[in-house]
Amino acid sequence: KNLKSPQKVEVDIIDDNFILRWNRSDESVGNVTFSFDYQKTGMDNWIKLSGCQNITSTKCNFSSLKLNVYEEIKLRIRAEKENTSSWYEVDSFTPFRKAQIGPPEVHLEAEDKAIVIHISPGTKDSVMWALDGLSFTYSLVIWKNSSGVEERIENIYSRHKIYKLSPETTYCLKVKAALLTSWKIGVYSPVHCIKTTVENELPPPENIEVSVQNQNYVLKWDYTYANMTFQVQWLHAFLKRNPGNHLYKWKQIPDCENVKTTQCVFPQNVFQKGIYLLRVQASDGNNTSFWSEEIKFDTEIQAFLLPPVFNIRSLSDSFHIYIGAPKQSGNTPVIQDYPLIYEIIFWENTSNAERKIIEKKTDVTVPNLKPLTVYCVKARAHTMDEKLNKSSVFSDAVCEKTKPGNTSK
């Protein structure tokens, strides 16, 4: 009896694992083995596929074959007993195009209200992704174990920290990789769970802001308690993207080590041009807080995104505000070469109730004011580019009295 060729051959490639699966064409024939050959583009001869010769099952692994993953390859299979079937040719394919990204490795660390997620490619030193190692981005799904309500976080790198969590709570998450340059989305990792710790005695510093004064950066933050010392550290932001490296060499800012105020001043030349992460930690001598949320600090934007300068023309029921370019030291105006949006906050001097206006124009009307009343105004600038989402600090407040009634013309 003639042996039939095997059918329905599937090639599965996950990272550097090459798996072939196929169907037996005749289940009634026992003791049949299967063998594969392969052929590279531009070659006439067929070569025996090592790892896939005289296979008794309907699956084989040819990961040991050192292929050029960007080169097209053709496979053929036949069945063998006393005689052999005809060859069945599989459609040619390029391994890289066919490959899927496998589940990444995930390592979790817990704080009281935060989780640090370290992500590594599932296959260390992968041949398939050798040219794409730095291009991986990750996305994750996280949920409280008790509720199951999922939150998705997209476009993260090999280290990510999730804040504002609840103490003593178990969170579960799964992560998948993506190579957006090749339109590839990977497979989710297994679910990993971790419990946040009891609440720490000292909370971390909050609301960290960087501003520029003369040739210095001024770093400010808020803290709950008095009589504390603080330290500030920085890290090159690109280091978060480095696959497989999970030793982050945070560096001290010398002028911000063991400071006793909730701000520190350091020269601009501490940082070369670039994007950095900054974090602050508090200590009372006995206990230490966890690190604050890490803020992104771009020297290019920071150097130029100064608080706006404005003039007020007071009427009886409104202010006209004219926004000008901020002044650097030496009173020279700064040229802003990217679009800005202005946030103007105003309030009655005797009240805490603030009102806000967001405006793209540099001349703004603040309406509905009461005559002969002192109002205060402060403003800040925001970049309109989402990728460079940056805000200046607020300008100093300027207070003016509105005119008597009927002077609105």
Epitope: L108, A110, E201, Q252, N286, T288
Partner: antibody, heavy 118, light 107 residues
């Protein structure tokens, strides 16, 4: 494979100084931290300090600040620990260790015994 | 400095026993705890890091758990080669500190 090889045993007089070395191989020391740990006879482990060989930034335990100096030479992949004003209680085995992923001291040298005796 | 207190300091036990060693920190260190094994005349060897992650090549009978201020190392079924001294260490803040050690001896 990763290896840390430390210099040989030292016998030194009280008040003198000693400089221990730790040569790394199988990895680039610039990419890691190098730590030093003390273990007195029959006692536990005590962290002395660490260096980032890339820029020579150091951290010390307060107890050793001022008497211990950690340096590194990236050209020879070697970290050093210098101890000054030695006293009898400095008699111990001193280990170097590599600080790797997740800040773990993942590989250790074989240790150097320093005996302070007159 | 963060103090780590291990208990017991000394444990006389037998092959096949389940052993639990605890480590208490004087303040919250998250999950930044490492466990080491040290045999006489040898260098310490990492067993567990980040409180619960077993180092590749370490037998599955070793497991770690805990967070905040209380951490545990469990050896599920003691083998002859496990008689050694075990140390916990915190890596949350400088200066790094170690527990005083737990010595396992054959009963």
């Amino acid at each position: 494979q990763v290896q840390l090889v430390q210099s040989g045993a030292e016998v030194v007089k009280p008040g003198a100084s000693v400089k221990l070395s730790c040569k790394g191989s199988g990895f680039n020391i610039k990419d890691y931290y190098m730590h030093w740990v003390k273990q007195a006879p029959g006692q536990g482990l005590e962290w002395i300090g660490r260096i980032d060989p890339e820029d020579a930034e150091t951290k010390y335990a307060p107890k050793f600040q001022g008497r211990a100096t950690i340096t590194a030479d990236t050209s020879t992949s070697t970290a050093y620990l210098e101890l000054s004003s030695l006293r009898s209680e400095d008699t111990a085995v001193y280990y170097c260790a590599r600080g790797g992923n997740f800040y773990v001291m993942d590989y250790w040298g074989q240790g150097t015994l320093v005996t302070v005796s007159s | 400095d963060i103090q780590l207190t291990q208990s017991p300091s000394f444990l006389s036990t037998s092959v096949g026993d389940r052993v639990t060693i605890t480590c208490k920190a004087s303040q919250n260190v998250g999950t930044n705890v490492v466990w080491y094994q040290q045999k006489p005349g040898k260098s310490p060897k990492v067993l567990i890091y980040s409180a619960s992650y077993r180092v590749s090549g370490v037998p599955s009978r070793f497991s770690g758990s805990g967070s905040g201020t209380e951490f545990t190392l469990i050896i599920s079924s003691l083998q002859p080669e496990d008689f050694a001294t075990y140390y916990c260490q915190q890596k949350n803040n400088y200066p790094y500190t170690f527990g005083q050690g737990t010595k396992l001896e054959i009963k």
